[in-house]
């Protein structure tokens, strides 16, 4: 076709951004391009072209009119992880092509098993008590909070400090006795550790 004066090659005007999304959830990788004639958009993951509903009507990935890639649900198995990877969109017309910046799609995860469950502790009143916990593996890395007798502990209380996976109670009182649970949390949800009993005895 003959070059028309008003035609111009594609340029990406909206680049995709990195995203972390939970398995089974929908998400979108944005891409918008300008050009005349209007460029076609294709997506590539880890260097390989991504199939969408344009290739297979049953696909869980849809190429939107804007050029964005919409995932009906993020698919992520024990082994096969077809949606996780590094994506680029490529806009093409007869005058050339434009490639977006890389965008990573990572799948959030939170395993069930705690790396370290807290264990029972026995202390004398007035002594410090330390309960330790390491949350399950996860992405993003899980944070933790603690519950006593199923109620979240107020971390602002002056005798309580939480650093890393350690709950430290200084100058313990009889009222501190009870069942303590460590809770690991990230965007996927929450996981409760096995409970540990804190026993406080009078000297």
């Amino acid at each position: 076709s003959r070059l028309r004066q008003e035609d111009f090659p594609p340029r990406i005007v909206e680049h995709p951004s990195d995203v972390i999304v939970s398995k089974g959830e929908p998400t979108t990788l944005n891409c918008k391009a300008e050009g005349r004639p209007t460029p076609t958009i294709e997506w590539y993951k880890d260097g390989e072209r991504v199939e969408t509903d344009k290739d297979d009507p049953r696909s869980h990935r849809m190429l939107l009119p804007s050029g964005s890639l919409f995932f009906l649900r993020i698919v992520h198995g024990r082994r096969s992880k077809p949606d996780e990877g590094t994506y680029v969109c490529v806009a093409r017309n007869y005058l050339g092509e434009a490639v977006s910046r890389n965008a990573s799609l990572e799948v959030a995860l939170l395993r069930d098993d705690f790396r370290q469950n807290p264990t029972d502790v026995v202390v004398a009143a007035g002594e410090p008590a330390i309960l330790e916990c390491q949350p399950p593996r996860g992405h993003p890395e899980p944070t933790i909070y603690w519950k006593k007798d199923k109620v979240r502990i107020d971390e602002k209380e002056e005798r309580i400090s939480i650093r890393g996976g350690k709950l430290m109670i200084s100058n313990t009182r009889k009222s501190d006795a009870g069942m303590y649970t460590c809770v690991g949390t990230n965007m996927v949800g929450e996981r409760d550790s096995d409970p540990a009993e804190l026993t406080v005895f009078e000297r």
Epitope: D46, G77, S80
Partner: antibody, heavy 118, light 105 residues
Amino acid sequence: EVQLVQSGAEVKKPGASVKVSCKASGYTFTGYYMHWVRQAPGQGLEWMGWINPKDGDTEFPQKFQGRVTMTRDTSITTAYMDLSRLRSDDTAVYYCARESGDDAFDIWGQGTMVTVSS
Amino acid sequence: DIVMTQSPSSLSASVGDRVTITCRASQSISSYLNWYQQKPGKAPKLLIYAASSLQSGVPSRFSGSGSGTDFTLTISSLQPEDFATYYCQQSVGLSFGGGTKVEIK
């Protein structure tokens, strides 16, 4: 259309090797693990191992370790299964199968009959 | 290794019958259990994944249930095209059950 197309039937002598190919099309080849499953005449399904096309990592059950090799060529979206030191009880139909993100074998090749006979 | 035990190994049934096939794992596999149908000379076909999820395009007369070690595949009303061999598979270590052949009574 998502499909797996396997190479044709083979007749081999005991002690020889066989290499079966599995050409994938219609999907992102590197996103899904590829498995090999065999079925001896009149018998059930036996899992032989997997390959991750993204990095070439493989895993096999103890029974096949040292005798099976799985490779892939991402440029032509093809997986290969090589079985060495063939015996008569290796006579079977060999299938490649894609593992979905739901942890199941959702797409299967048509099967390749391998006959081991002296 | 996780061993999958299917029962019965074969059964005879008539069109319209309700058919139940069971699969037992030698240790807990949570819901990592799939069911396949295979007809003579054909590759297996996925029916149910994750113990109870129906694969796209599979008739709703097929259903799966169970978790842990005990699982069931049910065909609510057997159709002529359902006479085949059915396999369970655990997707932790990937082994298959021995199969159940459903024959015409």
